[in-house]
């Protein structure tokens, strides 16, 4: 038994993957600050996870992927305020009892220090210096991310 | 309810650099973008560039290489600063709240003349 | 750059009746984000539509903004004494540009 968030992530997900191929993202688009290989967007209005989800899926992106602690650091060293919190990709997957990134992926232990507590509709806010455990339904900022594609010997139009 | 105010010299000397500032109340300047953009009678409104915190700023390409856009949170202000200035940069200057692309909050403008 | 022409450069209609601003770009905006504005002698631009149709906080439901790709329309339903006025496009979706406005006035 799915729940509501799941469904929303999947769908959207499904969504993005049905979408047509474009050309390689080779520079950040105006408003998103690079960091390494992605692009980040950081919201300044809030919204409950599933629908910072959406808002990123309209932008042609996704929740915030974390690929290990080094840069979840890097990631925190953007955020400039210290009480605002960010959503990121990652919820609670009651059917599988684990914490779940909306790629299909499970979260690593090892990777995040979570604070709080692994239960339904739970999903994971990052701070300047800490990873929450949040109800779902909270308002808060979000990260969008869209990855940059290394393209070699191709000339692609304005992305 | 946020307002901003534009405020710095009117007029400025061909060759000089024009510096404005944009005090932002009722509200915090942190966690936003903010733009500034001017209008001439010959070009129309023209976008100049933005600045979020002190982590990223952006310009319109057709003035990068003479613009920058600082910020001062602890004063809720952001600035423009437009170097080798010529009689085509007088304009009405306005300050603005970015929501990533379009402008809900403006200042009442400014106008800067570049004249010796 | 994207370059946007709005027509006409000026409409001369009546108090009630309805107005419809063209706004065209030369190349297609990406997900529709174009934004329009008012703007009166003396005063500063004022949002109406960002999204190509969402209307902004306090904007009444006699404008509507609607279009995609390279062709975009504002409307106002009922011309009320208050909108004769300047109105301009501003695409965000490559660089931020504005088109060279459409003045409505009274007829």
């Known amino acids: 038994q799915k729940s509501s968030i799941e469904k929303c992530s999947v769908d959207i997900q499904q969504s993005r993957n049905k979408t047509t191929e474009r050309p390689g993202l080779l520079n950040c688009p105006i408003y998103w600050q690079q960091l390494r290989e992605k692009c980040l967007l950081f919201s300044h209005t809030v919204n409950p996870w599933n629908n910072s989800l959406a808002d990123c899926s309209t932008k042609e992106s996704s929740l915030l992927l974390i690929r290990d602690k080094d840069e979840l650091i890097h990631t925190q060293n953007l955020i400039r305020d210290k009480a605002i919190l960010f959503w990121i990709g990652l919820n609670f997957s009651l059917s599988e009892k684990n914490w779940k990134w909306i790629n299909g992926s499970f979260l690593n232990s090892n990777d995040l220090e979570i604070r709080g507590d692994a239960k339904e509709n739970s999903c994971i806010s990052i701070s300047q210096t800490s990873v929450y455990s949040e109800y779902c339904s909270t308002e808060i900022r979000w990260i969008c991310q869209k990855e940059l594609t290394p393209v070699r010997n191709k000339v692609y139009p304005d992305s | 309810q946020v307002q901003l105010q534009e405020s710095g010299p009117g007029l400025v000397k061909p060759s000089e650099t024009l510096s404005l500032t944009c005090t932002v109340s009722?509200?915090?300047?942190?966690?936003?973008?903010w733009s500034w953009i001017r209008q001439t009678p010959g070009k129309g409104l023209e976008w100049i560039g933005y600045?979020?915190?002190?982590?990223?700023?952006d310009y319109n390409p057709s003035l990068k290489s003479r613009v920058t856009i600082s910020v001062d949170t602890s004063k809720n202000q952001f600035s423009l600063r437009l170097s080798s200035v010529t009689a085509a940069d007088t304009a009405v200057y306005y300050c603005?709240?970015?929501?990533?692309?379009?402008?809900?909050?403006w200042g009442q403008g400014t106008l800067v003349t570049v004249s010796s | 750059e994207i370059v946007l022409t709005q027509s006409p450069g000026t409409l001369s209609l009546s108090p009630g009746e309805r107005a419809t601003l063209s706004c065209r770009a030369s190349?297609?905006?990406?997900?529709?984000?174009l934004a329009w504005y008012q703007q009166k002698p003396g005063q500063a631009p004022r949002l109406l539509i960002y999204?190509?149709?969402s209307r902004a906080t306090g904007i009444p439901d006699r404008f509507s903004g609607s279009g995609s790709g390279t062709d975009f329309t504002l409307t106002i339903s009922r011309l009320e004494p208050e909108d004769f006025a300047v109105y301009y496009c501003?695409?965000?979706?490559?660089?931020?540009?504005f088109g060279g406005g459409t003045k409505v006035e009274i007829k």
């Open positions: 009722g509200g915090s300047i942190s966690g936003y973008y």
């Open positions: 501003q695409q965000y979706g490559s660089s931020l540009t």
């Open positions: 999204g190509a149709s």
């Open positions: 190349q297609s905006v990406r997900s529709s984000y």
């Open positions: 600045v979020y915190y002190s982590v990223s700023t």
């Open positions: 603005a709240r970015d929501e990533t692309g379009y402008f809900d909050y």
